[in-house]
Amino acid sequence: APVPPGEDSKDVAAPHRQPLTSSERIDKQIRYILDGISALRKETCNKSNMCESSKEALAENNLNLPKMAEKDGCFQSGFNEETCLVKIITGLLEFEVYLEYLQNRFESSEEQARAVQMSTKVLIQFLQKKAKNLDAITTPDPTTNASLLTKLQAQNQWLQDMTTHLILRSFKEFLQSSLRALRQM
């Protein structure tokens, strides 16, 4: 697993550095998760040919994965810091069930999958501290999540491979869009 944020070689080499600001900590946390996703995608792509499938072919799925849209306030056109922050937190909370699904999907990267899940929880906490309007954040219903998880786990092998690939790809894209928006705040 990659070294957790705040413990990379640069930090060791520069102990005199200023403590990280809240924004820097969030930035580093997202980059750490992206590293984890990259490692998981490597294993997925080595195991199946899903990574070669076109976006159009993969779009034919019934997963309701969070995605950034212009109305969410994270794009430069219509940028709104608070609306965007709410979207990022809500989206990450919605991804949690899918990250739970990933937990038994990896052989050599089991630890990495756990690290991505745990780091995402930490990221959510960081972002919640930054948000002013916590009331606007809707938490997914645990019962709905439980039945979704059961349904995903009951799929055949091919569909499970497809689902794994789609989750990783969509999560990466969501984090990249979030990273870009957060750096404008």
Epitope: R31, M68, F75, Q76, R169
Partner: antibody, heavy 122, light 107 residues
């Protein structure tokens, strides 16, 4: 292998609209983390970033020129476009398009086109 | 906007010299700092990414250091072909901004 090539009108008159095209190969603008930007450089001067467009169609503009700029893309044809309205002689420059791509969105411009020279003159 | 300030404006060197080019950001940009080289009548090319990451095809004599708002590009033994203008770039947030450049010339 990644290549980018700019094309434009060469010469135009003040108050006209400048239309530039960046045609690229070796990558797809539908890949997450991928972006293409426009940068210009008046002769003998420094680099000025103008606009950037991303895989998800998010667009960023230089605030000092925002009202004049429009960036767009045709992902299937591997092209990015920039329009600058109401040009002036100060817009005379070499215009470059460049790619940015990495997981962390570092906004580093790793491949550049050869540039297209634009002269605004009455 | 983040303002990037480069110094010196011009640097006259002798082949074999070790040189340092400075770049300062008006606010902290963490490690989102990149260096470009532009030779006469050519497009800029990425030299160093993210403060110190080397780029494929770029000679190892080029290296970068710094963090936060103060950055340095070093050339450990200048070659005649290194003549040109060197730009640093803020890659932290939009608008992307470049320094005015440091012109490297031979004495």
């Amino acid at each position: 292998q990644v290549t980018l090539k700019e094309s434009g009108p060469g010469i135009l008159k003040p108050s006209q609209t400048l239309s530039l095209t960046c045609s690229f190969s070796g990558f797809s603008l539908s890949t997450s983390g991928m972006g293409v930007g426009w940068i210009r450089q008046p002769s003998g001067k420094g680099l000025e970033w103008l606009a950037h467009i991303w895989w998800d169609d998010d667009k960023y503009y230089n605030p000092s020129l925002k009202s004049q700029l429009t960036i767009s893309k045709d992902t299937s044809r591997n092209q990015v476009f920039l329009k600058i309205t109401s040009v002036d002689t100060a817009d005379t420059a070499t215009y470059y398009c460049a790619r940015s791509y990495d997981d962390y969105l570092y906004y580093a411009l790793d491949y550049w086109g050869q540039g297209t020279s634009v002269t605004v003159s009455s | 906007d983040i303002v990037m300030t480069q110094s010196p404006a011009t640097l006259s060197v002798t082949p074999g010299d070790r040189v340092s080019l400075s770049c300062r950001a008006s606010q902290s940009i963490s490690d989102y700092l990149h260096w470009y080289q532009q030779k006469s009548h050519e497009s800029p090319r990425l030299l160093i990414k993210s403060v110190s990451q080397s780029i494929s095809g770029i000679p190892s004599r080029f290296s970068g250091s710094g963090s936060g708002s103060d950055f340095t590009l070093s050339i450990n033994s200048v070659e005649p072909e290194d003549v040109g203008v060197y730009y640093c770039q803020n890659g932290h947030s939009f608008p992307l901004t470049f320094g005015a450049g440091t012109k490297l010339e031979l004495k």
